[in-house]
Interface confidence: low
């Protein structure tokens, strides 16, 4: 069973998936669609790196631009370094400014 077939089988269960499962899924060439991504638990999405989200969404990663003001994308952007976001080339704004030392990301959540 390839990644896309596997994804179709588990798609309906993904709403409650933990971060660990999403990280594993990002390694399986699933090309998750934006509608499914937007239904994921915010707390499960937040720890994902830019590279992991890029792999998880595949070609659908471009859809992050249109969803940048909506959760969980908005909250995820706030936790990423701006220079990492810039590698996507989507013009996503609101990441941690380049050069800043990140001491406590949970503090940033509380402030947003």
């Amino acid at each position: 069973m390839n990644g896309s077939e596997y994804f179709v089988k588990i798609q309906s269960f993904l709403g409650g998936a933990p971060t660990e499962d999403l990280k594993a899924l990002s390694q399986q060439n699933v090309s998750m669609d934006l509608a499914t991504f937007m239904k994921l638990r915010t707390d499960a999405v937040l720890p994902l790196t830019v590279a992991e989200v890029q792999k998880l969404l595949g070609p659908h990663v471009e859809g992050l631009k249109a969803e940048e003001r909506h959760r969980p994308v908005r909250d995820w952007i706030l936790r990423q370094r701006q220079d990492d976001l810039d590698t996507l080339g989507l013009g996503l704004q609101g990441g941690i400014p380049n050069g800043y030392l990140v001491l406590d990301l949970s503090m940033q959540e509380a402030l947003s």
Epitope: N2, N29, D33, G58, P59, G63, G89, G91
Partner: antibody
Amino acid sequence: QLQLQESGPGLVKPSETLSLTCTVSGGSISSSSYYWGWIRQPPGKGLEWIGSVYYSGSAFYSPSLKSRLNISVDTSKKQFSLKLSSVTAADTAVYYCARRPYKSGLFDFWGQGTLVTVSS
Amino acid sequence: EIVMTQSPATLSVSPGERATLSCRASQSVSSNLAWYLQKPGQAPRLLIYGTSTRATGIPARFSGSGSGTEFTLTISSLQSEDFAVYYCQQYNTWPPEYTFGQGTKLEIK
């Protein structure tokens, strides 16, 4: 009814810059739902993706053309533009502008195309 | 770069008959594959996307199938307006690097 109209010189000299503009009418170029792209087709040959641009100005280029290519957007004029520098005869082609949904890389609406010949 | 290979280069079929066109990707493109039709002197027109979904206004006689690296476009009963060149295109790469097949010319037998 959406319309895409390419415009620009039909003849460009070798080593010069090819410049084309696509005007969008009957729809919004500023929609967050679409990218706007360029595809070309040399005479009697297949299709080649050149690049795409979002209304914000974010652009993606074909790796083989990236060093010579610039694609920009002017939302106030409802236009997006292609500039390809240092052209050679190999750049002779029909150039199409097209609309691309942001959620996928397919091209769902095309202009009629314009032939650009590179010759001295 | 993902290379898309279409076969055959030319296909001769009689009107009313069935036509089967193939497209192979050099590596998996999941289901992110589209088919276009192009008539002489015209721009390509989107037929199928997501491997099997017909674009708006495309007749039911056009159908697509496959996944991964092997894809097929089937035209169940050829009409005179269906004779044209058909291209497949993958859009499964990030950053975007979309590639087309070299085309299959469908001609009247």
